[in-house]
């Protein structure tokens, strides 16, 4: 599941990693755009082994993965779901 959140919270990420995570290990991705209390874009990845990590938005692999997910979400495929949540 790929989610884009617009929140008024401060930055969530303490440290960002650029280490590649295979898609089969990923359960959910959350994108927090910059602004609203945090000066940078944040990408949070939930892994299937019940761990959670912040990924460097500049990492090539996450950019490619998000592009694939965006394309799929705009097609007729039922999964993964692209959720735009605006409180």
């Amino acid at each position: 599941v790929l989610e884009v959140y617009y929140t008024s919270l401060r930055c969530r990420c303490v440290q960002e990693s650029s280490v590649f995570i295979p898609r089969r290990f990923i359960d959910r991705i959350q994108i927090l755009p910059r602004g609203n209390g945090c000066p940078r874009k944040e990408i949070i990845v939930w892994k299937k082994n019940k761990s959670i990590v912040c990924v460097d938005p500049q990492a090539e692999w996450i950019q490619r993965m998000m592009e694939v997910l965006r394309k799929r979400s705009s097609s007729t495929l039922p999964v993964p779901v692209f959720k735009r949540k605006i409180p």
């Epitope: 969530r12 990420c13 303490v14 440290q15 959910r28 944040e42 949070i44 939930w46 082994n49 019940k50 761990s51 959670i52 912040c54």
Partner: antibody
Framework: QVTLKESGPGILQPSQTLSLTCSFS??????????VGWIRQPSGKGLEWLAN???????YYNPSLINRLTISKNTSNNQAFLKITNVDAPDTATYYC??????????????WGQGIMVTVSS | DIQMTQSPSSLSASLGDRITITCQAS??????LIWFQQKPGKSPWPVIY???NLASGVPSRFSGSRSGSHYSLTISSLESEDMADYHC?????????FGSGTKLEIK
């Protein structure tokens, strides 16, 4: 307000099965990212992680005790359970349940129960 | 399993002292370390998370740091309410493992 409370027998005999219940409020184990763990502490000693159960029924155990541990949950009753088979004197300890929420920043065991003292004695 | 070697096991210090407690990890755990405070007869409570971040409501005299595989909890000016046991926990990978604990007493 998040609260957790452990319940179970205060005393049991060697070779018996210890059954503990964690009753909680202020969160739900049906919510994505929520988990409950069990930790124990022999009197005057350090903490030992035993097991975790997550919203999706994923379970993790301490390998040193995995053959004796079973963790489970009843989501609708807001309860988590731990069973330890074939108990012996070294299992005498205070047993805690604690909440974990898989959010960023991730702080496992951010809320704890008051603990329950369990004594194994013949 | 990752072993967490905590020292000292006990520590006696005076009010106003600066004290440091250390945990050494047997494998790389990055910043995935928490310090818990446990007051007598009470349950543990997080004071530092992700190695160096102050948990909500914790006084600023508490701080955490890392040097290689060594992780430290420092109290800059000891107060009587800091008398407690302190435990480190690594949560980089299962099984989660705690240090053996440090009992902090006031002289």
């Amino acid at each position: 307000q998040v609260t957790l409370k452990e319940s179970g027998p205060g005393i049991l005999q060697p070779s018996q099965t210890l059954s503990l219940t964690c009753s909680f409020s202020g969160f739900s184990l049906s919510t994505y990212g929520m988990g409950v763990g069990w930790i124990r502490q022999p009197s005057g000693k350090g903490l030992e992680w035993l097991a975790n159960i997550w919203w999706d029924d994923d379970k993790y155990y301490n390998p040193s005790l995995i053959n004796r541990l079973t963790i489970s949950k009843n989501t609708s009753n807001n309860q988590a359970f731990l069973k330890i088979t074939n108990v012996d004197a070294p299992d005498t300890a205070t047993y805690y349940c604690a909440r974990s929420e898989l959010v960023m920043p991730y702080v496992p065991f951010d809320f704890w129960g008051q603990g329950i003292m369990v004594t194994v004695s013949s | 399993d990752i072993q967490m070697t905590q020292s000292p096991s006990s520590l006696s210090a005076s009010l106003g002292d600066r004290i440091t407690i250390t945990c050494q990890a047997s494998q790389d755990i990055g910043i995935d370390l928490i310090w818990f405070q446990q007051k007598p007869g009470k349950s543990p409570w997080p004071v530092i998370y992700y190695t160096a971040n102050l948990a909500s409501g914790v006084p600023s005299r508490f701080s955490g740091s890392r040097s290689g595989s060594h992780y430290s909890l420092t109290i800059s000016s000891l107060e009587s309410e800091d008398m407690a046991d302190y435990h480190c926990l690594q949560y980089k990978q299962y099984p989660f493992t705690f240090g053996s604990g440090t009992k902090l007493e006031i002289k």
